[in-house]
């Protein structure tokens, strides 16, 4: 990733201004490292692209909840 050169952590410097359709999201990870300027969520889309989002926004929290439920539900 462009901001992970020489370090194992990716930081977010800007957040998306857009609500992403949850159907486009595959997974997420939280960015809490002290090396980064702000806490963030990085969503990975179904085509493996990454997007920085603000964990304080409701749509981000709802999307994380949705993805959590998806991973908890066994696929038949």
């Amino acid at each position: 990733q462009p901001d992970a050169i020489n370090a194992p952590v990716t930081c977010c410097y800007n957040f998306t201004n857009r609500k992403i359709s949850v159907q486009r999201l595959a997974s997420y990870r939280r960015i809490t490292s002290s090396k980064c300027p702000k806490e963030a969520v990085i969503f990975k889309t179904i085509v493996a692209k990454e997007i920085c989002a603000d964990p304080k926004q409701k749509w981000v929290q709802d999307s994380m909840d949705h993805l959590d439920k998806q991973t908890q539900t066994p696929k038949t």
Epitope: C12, T16, R18, I20, Q23, E50
Partner: antibody
Framework: EVQLVQSGGGLVQPGGSLRLSCAAS????????MSWVRQAPGKGLEWLAN????????YYVDSVKGRFTISRDNAKNSLYLQMNSLRAEDTAVYFC???????????????WGRGTLVTVSS | AIQLTQSPSSLSASVGDRVILTCRAS??????LAWYQQKPGKAPKLLIY???SLESGVPSRFSGSGSGPDFTLTISSLQPEDFATYFC?????????FGGGTKVEIK
């Protein structure tokens, strides 16, 4: 097949109007922002406008603000550009494009229509 | 609006050459920069997004780098199908803007 098929270009007189259409197929159109980009003959690319998934949020470049209107019909998987008060300098190939989010910003284009030529001339 | 200046505006190169194109932003755009290839009469094709991420299906001879004001697109070994015009584009802020392009021609 994932594609954007454009229609609606042509010759129009200065001051006239034209409506461009872009039909999407092969992907869930309602999940994506969409944009219009134009290219004057022999020139570079100019982003014109984009529209949110449900059509509630729109952005325009200053050069077309108040004259052009972007809209969409998700039931028809279609994007539109209504162009009014056309000028000679609006002569260009107009492209529709699927508009994505990046890691640190919003608005790059991973899927394009083939373009449609709009000529504004008397 | 953020202005993007590409250099050179055109260049001549041979098959197998290493080619470096540059794009300079008038303001900081973080890593929110994309590169496109366009051939005559065709729509642009996305090559690179987020300054350095290779779009799916794009050959690995294309690479992007940079952040802040200066960005580069490198073609490690120019192929016959690479002769085209290349545009950079910033998506850090509205209005979204493109560079003026660099035309890569056959020497």
């Amino acid at each position: 097949e994932v594609q954007l098929v454009q229609s609606g270009g042509g010759l129009v007189q200065p001051g006239g109007s034209l409506r461009l259409s872009c039909a999407a197929s092969g992907f869930t159109f309602s999940h994506y922002w969409m944009s219009w980009v134009r290219q004057a003959p022999g020139k570079g690319l100019e982003w014109l406008a984009n529209i949110e998934q449900d059509g509630s949020e729109k952005y325009y470049v200053d050069s077309v603000k108040g004259r052009f209107t972007i809209s969409r019909d998700n039931a028809k998987n279609s994007l539109y550009l209504q162009m009014n008060s056309l000028r000679a300098e609006d002569t260009a190939v107009y492209f529709c494009a699927r508009d994505l989010e990046g890691l640190h910003g919003d608005g790059y284009f991973d899927l394009w229509g083939r373009g449609t030529l709009v000529t504004v001339s008397s | 609006a953020i202005q993007l200046t590409q250099s050179p505006s055109s260049l001549s190169a041979s098959v197998g050459d290493r080619v470096i194109l540059t794009c300079r932003a008038s303001q900081g755009v973080s890593s929110a920069l994309a590169w496109y290839q366009q051939k005559p009469g065709k729509a642009p094709k996305l090559l690179i997004y987020d300054a350095s991420s290779l779009e799916s299906g794009v050959p690995s001879r294309f690479s992007g780098s940079g952040s802040g004001p200066d960005f580069t697109l490198t073609i490690s070994s120019l192929q016959p199908e690479d002769f085209a015009t290349y545009f950079c584009q910033q998506f850090n802020s509205y209005p979204l803007t493109f560079g003026g392009g660099t035309k890569v021609e056959i020497k």
